[in-house]
């Protein structure tokens, strides 16, 4: 015999108190699959969490973090402090990327600049704390007499010594 509850679609629940008829999920609750005997309570995005997507009868609310923070975890269960581009979050807080590394996002770690010479290329644009170097054509690609691209010396920013 087929379970009568299996006919209840998402957004409803199988109401045992009403001869197993399909009742709509009450306000602030949802069921994302059919055949459910209860609806789940909607997540509320409070405090540092803000609503990215409202709850509907068939899907839970989705949260993200207030400006200055970014999500961690499945479904944004925690918020972590942003840093600026050119920084990484360390145990001492946000710190500038060391010389020779960069971070172009407000989260994550500083990564080494691309080593253009490994690909036989030259440096077209120097790297910064916020941006990777841009590699140019390999010296062999430059025909004799063509304007050569001289790899500039790595520009050290004032007060930003190697660490």
């Amino acid at each position: 015999l087929q379970d009568p509850c299996s006919n209840c679609p998402a957004g409803t629940f199988c109401d045992n108190n009403r001869n197993q008829i399909c009742s709509p999920c009450p306000p602030n609750s949802f069921s994302s699959a059919g055949g459910q005997r209860t609806c789940d309570i909607c997540r509320q995005c409070k405090g540092v969490f803000r609503t990215r997507k409202e709850c509907s009868s068939t899907s839970n609310a989705e949260c993200d973090c207030t400006p200055g923070f970014h999500c961690l975890g499945a479904g944004c269960s925690m918020c972590e402090q942003d840093c600026k581009q050119g920084q990484e979050l360390t145990k001492k807080g946000c710190k500038d990327c060391c010389f020779g590394t960069f971070n172009d996002q407000k989260r994550g770690i500083c990564r080494p600049w691309t080593n253009c010479s490994l690909d036989g290329k030259s440096v077209l644009v120097n790297g910064t704390k916020e941006r990777d170097v841009v590699c140019g054509p390999s010296p062999a690609d430059l025909s004799p007499g063509a304007s050569s691209v001289t790899p500039p010396a790595p520009a050290r920013e004032p007060g930003h010594s190697p660490q």
Epitope: K46, G47, V48, L72, G73, A74, S77, M78
Partner: antibody
């Protein structure tokens, strides 16, 4: 820097109420939920409840639902916890703490002693 | 409610020792696990959040790992200031719940 400063120690009689305060500084008070946690002498940590200062919305541990009331005054960046019908086993240190999905900053705690 | 079982409840160790504290949840908490340190004076500090992320200012001798229901706090080389009580806490569901604590004492 971010700081939570709690009110001073209280000695109260059984059956009475106590209202504790937690003053926040160094961040936007309304932007973070405030949670309250207690620790009885020699015991572990127990969650009482939380308040969203922006909306006044609260969540309570069922154990405290009938006796705890959480409020917040955003104009002075202060959260409050009132506990009524006090019993001797409510003797504990009460902490407020800011929530990011983890409790990153804690108040210094307020000792409440329930004694006749 | 999600139960958090922490072990051992107390532990004697010496400066320089490697120490491991474990925490088991009664259901999958999807890495939503945090660790706190409480000194005898009562002050509570966050050490690690989201299983393994070190909070600002916490020395790198502290580390966390785990998934599902089983989680671990490790102190790689104990320092005199590490003798304290440690608590785990889950943020997967309300009510937030804590482990019973591990008191780390000097041998």
């Amino acid at each position: 820097q971010v700081q939570l400063v709690q009110s001073g120690a209280e000695v109260v009689k059984p059956g009475a109420s106590v209202k504790l305060s937690c003053k926040a500084s160094g961040y936007t008070f309304a932007g973070f939920e405030m949670h309250w946690i207690r620790q009885a002498p020699g015991q572990g940590l127990g969650w009482i409840g939380a308040i969203d200062p922006k909306t006044g919305g609260t969540d309570y541990n069922q154990k405290f639902k009938d006796r705890a009331t959480l409020t917040a005054d955003t104009s002075i960046s202060t959260a409050y916890m009132e506990l009524s019908r006090l019993r001797s086993d409510d003797t504990a240190v009460y902490y407020c703490t800011r929530d990011l999905g983890y409790f990153d900053v804690w108040g210094q705690g307020t000792l409440v002693t329930v004694s006749s | 409610d999600i139960q958090m079982t922490q072990s051992p409840s107390s532990l004697s160790a010496s400066v320089g020792d490697r120490v491991t504290i474990t925490c088991r949840a009664s259901q999958d908490i999807r890495s939503n696990l945090n660790w706190y340190q409480q000194k005898p004076g009562g002050a509570v500090k966050l050490l690690i959040y989201y299983t393994s992320r070190l909070h600002s200012g916490v020395p790198s001798r502290f580390s966390g790992s785990g998934s599902g229901t089983d989680y671990t706090l490790t102190i790689s080389s104990l320092q005199p200031e590490d003798f304290a009580t440690y608590f785990c806490q889950q943020s997967e569901k309300l009510p937030r719940t804590f482990g019973g604590g591990t008191k780390l004492e000097i041998r």
